[in-house]
Interface confidence: low
Amino acid sequence: ILGGREAEAHARPYMASVQVNGEHLCGGVLVAEQWVLSAAHCLEDAADGKVQVLLGAHSLSQPEPSKRLYDVLRAVPHPDSRPDTIDHDLLLLQLSEKATLGPAVRPLPWQRVDRDVEPGTLCDVAGWGIVSHAGRRPDRLQHVLLPVLDRATCNRRTHHDGAITQRMMCAESNRRDSCKGDSGGPLVCGGVLEGVVTSGSRVCGNRKKPGIYTRVASYAAWIDSVLA
């Protein structure tokens, strides 16, 4: 997260760290007791490593009573996701067992009504992604509030040049932005999961290159079918 600040510890109990061989790779969001939603491209970087999900964490390194690492029973990328595009960049991870819920571990309600968030709405994005262009990684969860940017502006030739489909949304990126390592994490508007950080290699913190998020409401049928 660029231009953000340290999050209040355990105030985002839905927050997950998707890890490979014990290292943070991507963000994720607990959407059901046994399911974490993340970005499909995150798996590409996992190669053949052991994928696990850390829940209940604030610090990645320090012991915390609520922290627990779960093995992944099943990884289900969206069937239409492709390595060369950010379209359909969603991944559902089934934990090896139901998560132990508590104040620091709780699923987040996700948006099912397929309607765009009003431009200008302030939404919260959190993650353990890099906090500087030099690539410095934080140990503790960071967050930032970002205004939603309308799709027409986001699709301007000077911005994302038409790449933003109806199934995506954008947020402003003027110095405050999600960045590498935040992919798969939640964009939360009004206490509801609206978007998932896409995992393309995008310049961060440049206002002409807004953050791109996959709109979960556009994938309600797919999410329901996997969770069923």
Partner: antibody, heavy 122, light 107 residues
Framework: EVQLQQSGPELVKPGASVKISCKAS????????MNWVKQSPEKSLEWIGD????????TYNQKFKAKATLTVDKSSSTAYMQLKSLTSEDSAVYYC???????????????WGQGTLVTVSA | DIVMTQSHKFMSTSVGDRVSITCKAS??????VDWYQQKPGQSPKLLIY???TRHTGVPDRFTGSGSGTDYTLTISSVQAEDLALYYC?????????FGGGTKLEIK
């Protein structure tokens, strides 16, 4: 199927105003700028301006800034253009047009309304 | 404003011929050029965008080329239904501007 349905022909008196409409269907109205283009025999095609249906923000061709006002009604997915202080030079066919996008690249004005003929005559 | 000049207002050709319609911009527009076809009584129809990319459903006899200030629309083998007005347009900077049009007539 993307469609832009414009209002019918208008016969108006010099000095009057006219408001023409363009109803969009088959795509997300708020996702793409709506453009307006004038076609007259003398000047061929001229871009009047565009409006961002999501925010109502407009960009005008300076030449038309005092002549045209662009608005939208998101609830009905309709764009409007009001032309004021009409003269015979404003007699023309007016089109609404929207760019559309495929994959990751901008496409020109891929969709056009059928045009609205405005005739200014005493 | 960027001026787009189509030097030929009319071009006469025969069915099966190859024809090239040219367009010159008053400054470098970095391939941000679209081509439109307009048949009598119809709205303009997008043929080519980004100077050389054919729009969906456009026959492959239509080809766009060019860079900098000079752009060309080529019809490799003219068909009777290609009788129309052809316009270039720049989307490099606002106000977007069109050429004056070239009317293709069939001999």
């Amino acid at each position: 199927e993307v469609q832009l349905q414009q209002s019918g022909p208008e016969l108006v008196k010099p000095g009057a105003s006219v408001k023409i409409s363009c109803k969009a269907s088959g795509y997300s109205f708020t996702g793409y700028y709506m453009n307006w283009v004038k076609q007259s025999p003398e000047k061929s095609l001229e871009w009047i301006g565009d409006i961002n249906p999501s925010t109502g923000g407009t960009t005008y061709n300076q030449k038309f800034k005092a002549k045209a006002t662009l608005t939208v009604d998101k609830s009905s997915s309709t764009a409007y253009m009001q032309l004021k202080s009409l003269t015979s030079e404003d007699s023309a066919v007016y089109y609404c047009a929207t760019p559309y996008y495929y994959g990751s690249s901008y496409v020109g004005f891929a969709y056009w309304g059928q045009g609205t003929l405005v005739t200014v005559s005493a | 404003d960027i001026v787009m000049t189509q030097s030929h207002k009319f071009m006469s050709t025969s069915v099966g011929d190859r024809v090239s319609i040219t367009c010159k911009a008053s400054q470098d527009v970095s391939t941000a050029v679209d081509w439109y076809q307009q048949k009598p009584g119809q709205s303009p129809k997008l043929l080519i965008y980004w100077a050389s990319t054919r729009h969906t459903g456009v026959p492959d006899r239509f080809t766009g080329s060019g860079s900098g200030t000079d752009y060309t629309l080529t019809i490799s083998s003219v068909q009777a239904e290609d009788l129309a007005l052809y316009y270039c347009q720049q989307h490099y900077s606002t106000p977007w501007t069109f050429g004056g049009g070239t009317k293709l007539e069939i001999k």
